[in-house]
């Protein structure tokens, strides 16, 4: 029950996180004009990963896409890449985790398969979350660097007569959305990985014992039947080794994970 709850909660948390990563990636407010020096501006600038916008006091808002690819800063391209990779991995992770959910029955899928899928999706969520956090952090670092650079030469003028105020940018809402969303995806991934441990069947390592019947050299391996968890269709008896003459050394092996596929 706890495993199902952990897995379900991990899935929901990751789903919210990935939705947040998508939202952050699409948002225009990655950086917003710093109003410290001019709190009464009639023109407000803000920028996203894909376009920059200007909102006027009149209510008119104009956004322009970055139609160049080569002319964009490498850091911005890197942030875009990280966010897209995060979304793609997260989306695949969600798809995998849907089938891995303990509460969803798909044919005769065994717990071991679901455990593997849960682990896979968990890892994908963790990497997705890390990509988002990294992307947002790189952008934030870029902003901080540019902020202090523009503060250093805030005003440039001719004999102090004419002032050209340089527009400074500070953290936009998308950064906080991205950080939170990345964190949630990461937490969701960790929860999926924890759930995976509970999903994996309890395996007791018994030594294989050989029984030699006269005329037949058939080896049977105790524990050769899959332990049923009482959930799903695990009731079929599976014989690991078919009859056949084998040496004792061959037969007396520890059960490996391949024995339970």
């Amino acid at each position: 029950m706890a495993v199902t709850a952990c897995q379900g909660l991990g899935f929901v948390v990751s789903l919210i996180g990935i939705a947040g990563i998508i939202a952050a990636t699409c948002m225009d407010q990655w950086s917003t004009q710093d109003l410290y020096n001019n709190p009464v501006t009639a023109v407000f600038n803000y920028q996203g990963l894909w376009r920059s916008c200007v909102r006027e006091s009149s209510g008119f808002t104009e956004c322009r896409g970055y139609f160049t690819l080569l002319g964009l800063p490498a850091m911005l391209q890197a942030v875009r890449a990280l966010m897209i990779v995060g979304i793609v991995l997260g989306a695949i992770g969600l798809l995998v985790s849907i089938f891995a959910l303990k509460c969803i029955r798909i044919g005769s899928m065994e717990d071991s398969a679901k455990a593997n899928m849960t682990l896979t999706s968990g890892i994908m969520f963790i990497v997705s979350g890390l990509c988002a956090i990294a992307g947002v952090s790189v952008f934030a670092n870029m902003l901080v660097t540019n902020f202090w650079m523009s503060t250093a030469n805030m005003y440039t003028g001719m004999g102090g007569m004419v002032q050209t105020v340089q527009t400074r940018y500070t953290f936009g809402a998308a950064l906080f959305v991205g950080w939170v969303a990345g964190g949630l995806t990461l937490i969701g991934g960790v929860m999926m990985c924890i759930a995976c441990r509970g999903l994996a069947p309890e395996e007791t390592n018994y030594k294989a014992v050989s029984y030699h019947a006269s005329g037949h050299s058939v080896a049977y391996k105790p524990g050769g039947f899959k332990a049923s968890t009482g959930f799903g269709s695990n009731t079929k008896n599976k014989k690991i080794y078919d009859g056949g003459a084998r040496t004792e050394d061959e037969v007396q092996s520890y059960p490996s994970k391949h024995d339970y596929v």
């Epitope: 600038n45 200007v54 006091s57 105020v165």
Partner: antibody
């Protein structure tokens, strides 16, 4: 047709109060930022105050800050300017204007004259 | 506050002549976000409210004759009338639309000789 009609002007004593109204028609009033601009007799134009679309932000000229209050009633399509502690230098024709692209004022009312005199 | 200074204060020209008036701001009106200059030009004829001619320094308002043109960037702006007509007699104002308080120039009065 866009129309802005100011009213409420008149003669008032120094220290007195007056409330100007601007009735808007011919456009979606609630979707526009509105301003008041004044012009003293024989002088140039002076921006007085601006109220943003939702009414949440208001801006004032230093000369009227603390004395004048701009407000709007979107349900009545009306812009207001409450003027308190009036001074002789507030004597002017007050225009109601609509802001558009570039924060420019594309439509102006005919104006209402406010005279502050004892 | 941004100070707007217009020159000349007044000018008298003959009909059909080309006229140029200037407007200078104490701070740049160029917005880096969209590379637009937040300056507008108005025409005020005697006994009338002002009329918008240009916004974003050079974007002509609909209904404004094409003999009028606006130019300039940063801190220096110009309003040009290629061929002055009798109906162009008015006072012309430039305005800072970039930051509050919105400020107007003192105006340039255009007269016919």
């Amino acid at each position: 047709e866009v129309q802005l009609l100011e009213s409420g002007g008149g003669l008032v004593q120094p220290g007195g109060s007056l409330r100007l109204s601007c009735a808007a028609s011919g456009f979606t009033f609630s979707s526009y930022t509105m301003s008041w601009v004044r012009q003293a007799p024989g002088k140039g134009l002076e921006w007085v105050a601006t109220i943003i679309i939702g009414g949440s932000y208001t801006y004032y000229a230093d000369s009227v800050k603390g004395r004048f209050t701009i407000s709007r009633d979107n349900s009545k399509n009306t812009l207001y300017l409450q003027m308190n502690s009036l001074r002789a230098e507030d004597t002017a024709v007050y225009y109601c204007t609509r802001l558009v692209k570039g924060n420019a004022m594309d439509y102006w009312g005919q104006g209402t004259l406010v005279t502050v005199s004892s | 506050d941004i100070v707007m200074t217009q020159s000349p204060d007044s000018l008298a020209v003959s009909l059909g002549e080309r006229v140029t008036m200037n407007c200078k701001s104490s701070q740049s009106l160029l917005n880096s976000g969209n590379q637009k200059n937040y300056l507008s030009w108005y025409q005020q004829k005697p006994g009338q409210p002002p009329k918008l001619l240009f916004y974003w320094a050079s974007t002509r308002e609909s209904g404004v004759p094409d003999r009028f043109s606006g130019s300039g960037s940063g801190t220096d702006f110009t309003l040009t009338i290629s061929s002055v007509q009798a109906e162009d007699v008015a006072v012309y104002y430039c305005q800072n639309d970039y930051s509050y308080p919105f400020t107007f120039g003192q105006g340039t009065k255009l007269e016919i000789k």
